[in-house]
Interface confidence: low
């Protein structure tokens, strides 16, 4: 294999034939970002998932999926060294494989979930190239406590992680949607308080707003400086 090829961090190509599989190549020890474009209108309101094909006729085993609340799909979720984030307006699902290892190579799928069904957005073949410098940067070992196996990968879990300095927390289109929701909530809250004061009511007695914005009591939405992945 020519030296130039080893220096390529990412190489995307379409395989010939009916498989229609996209190949993503990454270098061992480094990060690989996989993108799965989709029709944002067709898949509106649907959560997404990243799974590994276990066999020719076997199931696709879930590795990680987007946030349980679709409106919070922009929040990056982790399972071990694999992260997923969804730009629901732009129609791009992004999967990041940190500290890529040879055993990460294989066939995967980006999926759109609806009920118990799953539509395949893209079939992805991940290939791992040897590190031309043959070194391992300790900075790439994000979660040393995590097993490198996919044992119990169907059991989804997230790792809380503070956003790194300079890291974009989520796509611009999604942040606009979130800010719009927050702005509307503030306007409604202010209006309710103003109405309560006007009618001489106690501030706590105003009717609850019907605008949910996907907010669940179990999730505390924090402002950007303190934002953490759920």
């Amino acid at each position: 294999m020519e030296p130039l090829r080893l220096l390529i961090l990412l190489f995307v190509t379409e395989l010939s034939g009916a498989h229609n599989t996209t190949v993503f190549q990454g270098v061992a020890g480094q990060s690989l970002q996989v993108s799965c474009p989709y029709d944002s209108m067709k898949h509106w309101g649907r959560r997404k998932a990243w799974c590994r094909q276990l066999g020719e006729k076997g199931p696709c085993q879930r590795v990680v999926s987007t946030h349980n609340l679709w409106l919070l799909s922009f929040l990056r979720r982790w399972n071990g060294s694999t992260a997923i984030t969804d730009d629901t307006l732009g129609g791009t699902l992004t999967i990041t494989l940190r500290n890529l290892q040879p055993h990460d190579a294989g066939l995967y799928q980006c999926q759109s979930l609806h009920g118990s069904e799953a539509d395949t957005l893209r079939k992805v073949l991940v290939e791992v190239l040897a590190d031309p410098l043959d070194h391992r940067d300790a900075g790439d070992l994000w979660f040393p406590g995590e097993s490198e196996s996919f044992e119990d990968a169907h059991v989804e879990h997230s790792i809380s992680r503070s956003l790194l300095e300079g890291e974009i927390p989520f796509p611009p289109t999604s942040i606009l949607l979130l800010l719009a929701c927050i702005f509307l909530i503030k306007i409604l809250a202010a209006s309710a308080l103003w109405a309560a004061a006007w009618h001489g009511q106690k501030p706590g007695t105003h009717p609850p707003s019907e605008l949910d914005c996907g907010h669940d009591p179990g999730y505390q939405l924090q402002t950007l400086p303190g934002l953490r992945d759920t």
Epitope: M1, R5, Q25, G55, H103, A105, E127, S149, A153
Partner: antibody, heavy 119, light 107 residues
């Protein structure tokens, strides 16, 4: 159905390079991954390395410095080169197809070829 | 690398008897485990993949079970052609590794 056939010299001198070729028939090499596995006489199996038709390779760390696997899609063949051989490299060498994923089980296998390292 | 330990090293049984072969991994390999049969002078033949799925053309008397670190290959009723060496192989961790083998011989 896919069949694999190993070919190459049965005797190699110490310090020389062992060269074997695997010819795939009954199917295209331009899909799946392909591996070399060896078995010293009376011992267990050891995976050597694998290659994809695109040329992407992975080797067993214990042999990495001495192994080169290449592919020739036009001939539907892939090859193994093992340099600086010693008597410890005497074994039956098998080529095999990965049943599915690049990291996967092996099926089918070639019938194997015995390579003896001796002066 | 993952070490696979097979036991027993040798199993002496008669045709018609039940054979139970064990494979233990040094750490969890989930269900990413295969079993092979090898007869003298022949290449290994895939019997089971993904711990319990029979490969094409493999008789129903062969079955695999287990997950994590402990796996079992069971031959419900031994046929004369089943006397051979059996290997397990994991394929989740790099590099893929094989167990040392269990020889099933005629008692």
């Amino acid at each position: 159905q896919v069949q694999l056939q190993e070919s190459g010299p049965g005797l190699v001198k110490p310090s020389e390079t062992l060269s074997l070729t695997c010819t795939v028939s009954g199917g295209s090499i331009s899909s799946y991954y392909w591996s070399w596995i060896r078995q010293p006489p009376g011992k267990g199996l050891e995976w050597i390395g694998s290659i994809y038709y695109s040329g992407s390779t992975n080797y067993n760390p214990s042999l990495k410095s001495r192994v080169t696997i290449s592919v020739d899609t036009s001939k539907n063949q892939f090859s193994l080169k093992l340099s600086s051989v010693t008597a410890a490299d005497t074994a039956v060498y098998y080529c095999a197809r990965h049943g599915w994923d690049r990291v996967g089980w092996f099926d089918p296998w070639g019938q194997g070829t015995l390579v003896t390292v001796s002066s | 690398e993952i070490v696979l330990t097979q036991s027993p090293a040798t199993l002496s049984l008669s045709p018609g008897e039940r054979a139970t072969l064990s494979c233990r991994a040094s750490q969890s390999v989930s269900r990413y485990l295969a079993w092979y049969q090898q007869k003298p002078g022949q290449a290994p033949r895939l019997l089971i993949y993904d711990a319990s799925n029979r490969a094409t053309g493999i008789p129903a008397r062969f079955s695999g079970s287990g997950s994590g670190t402990d796996f079992t290959l069971t031959i419900s009723s031994l046929e004369p052609e089943d006397f051979a060496v059996y290997y397990c192989q994991q394929y989740i961790f790099w590099p893929p590794t094989f167990g040392g083998g269990t020889k099933v011989e005629i008692k």
